[in-house]
């Protein structure tokens, strides 16, 4: 759920890493209310996820490793 470029709340679903092509991080500031990881899926969707959740951290770590290898 996002308002323009800001995530307003987190998904209540768990996504598989195979579904995700990349991510961006949203930091809470004067523009956006919450910290979030925005996953970009193979279907072109942007999914707002809670950066504190284990499954989110795992995917971010996996994607970051991939990026660092390139």
């Amino acid at each position: 759920a996002s308002n323009f470029d800001c995530c307003l709340r987190y998904t209540d679903r768990i996504l598989h890493p195979k579904f995700i092509v990349g991510f961006t991080q949203q930091l809470a500031n004067e523009t956006c209310d919450i910290n979030a990881v925005i996953f970009h899926t193979k279907k072109g969707l942007s999914v707002c996820a809670n950066p504190k959740q284990t499954w989110v951290k795992l995917i971010v770590r996996r994607l970051s490793k991939k990026i660092n290898k390139m």
């Epitope: 996504l15 598989h16 504190k52």
Partner: antibody, heavy 120, light 107 residues
């Protein structure tokens, strides 16, 4: 070795609640998810929901929201599922199963299942 | 939710034969598919994960293939011990959904 121990059976009255347990051993409890799966007699498998024991994060199949509540006690490495307002539709075998994101999010170990019978 | 459709619902084959079970998803699940084997009176067991990877302790007579929306499980040189119900499962996104199952019997 990895083991998930579940009580064999529960007999409960319609309208009542039941809380079933799943005691994990042989691995670090907080490093793996715990899923719950329902199987009615002669029918297929239905995913109820999952809990992450490291932070108690849960997500449910919409169909079971309000019916099932998943919790954990990390001190005893035990997962629990409470089912409320029971009807005959809830008579089934309920499995706890370890979710392993290291092997493609698969459920790699299963408990023996708790058979729940709802009857007056 | 992603729907999983398995076929056939049941099949009977002779010892030594090769059988194939198929599983179709209602949308692309990008290989996020697992197979389970459930023998009579027992709990399900992980058989194949990630569409193609054999789970620890399972016979190499089992193999998984497929991509996109279509997947299959092949059992070669059928053994009497293979009598079971086989389920596919989508793990792309919750809620995780199972196929209806394929009951395998020996002729």
């Amino acid at each position: 070795q990895v083991q998930l121990q579940q009580p064999g059976a529960e007999l409960v009255k319609p309208g009542a609640s039941v809380k079933m347990s799943c005691k994990a051993s042989g691995y670090t409890f907080t490093n793996y998810w715990m899923h719950w799966v329902k199987q009615r007699p002669g029918q297929g498998l239905e995913w109820i929901g999952v809990i992450d024991p490291s932070d108690s994060y849960t997500t449910y199949n919409q169909k079971f929201k309000g019916k099932a509540t998943l919790t954990v006690d990390t001190s005893s490495s035990t997962a629990y599922m409470q089912l409320s307002s029971l009807t005959s539709e809830d008579s089934a075998v309920y499995y706890c199963t370890r979710g392993n994101y290291g092997v493609d999010y698969a459920m790699d170990y299963w408990g023996q299942g708790t058979s729940v019978t709802v009857s007056s | 939710d992603i729907q999983m459709t398995q076929s056939p619902a049941s099949l009977s084959a002779s010892v030594g034969e090769t059988v194939t079970i198929t599983c179709g998803a209602s949308e692309n699940i990008y290989g996020a598919l697992n197979w389970y084997q459930r023998k009579q009176g027992k709990s399900p067991q992980l058989l194949i994960y990630g569409a193609t990877n054999l789970a620890d302790g399972m016979s190499s007579r089992f193999s998984g293939s497929g991509s996109g929306r279509q997947y299959s499980l092949k059992i070669s040189s059928l053994h009497p011990d293979d009598v079971a119900t086989y389920y596919c499962q989508n793990v792309l996104i919750t809620p995780y959904t199972f196929g209806g199952g394929t009951k395998l019997e020996i002729k």
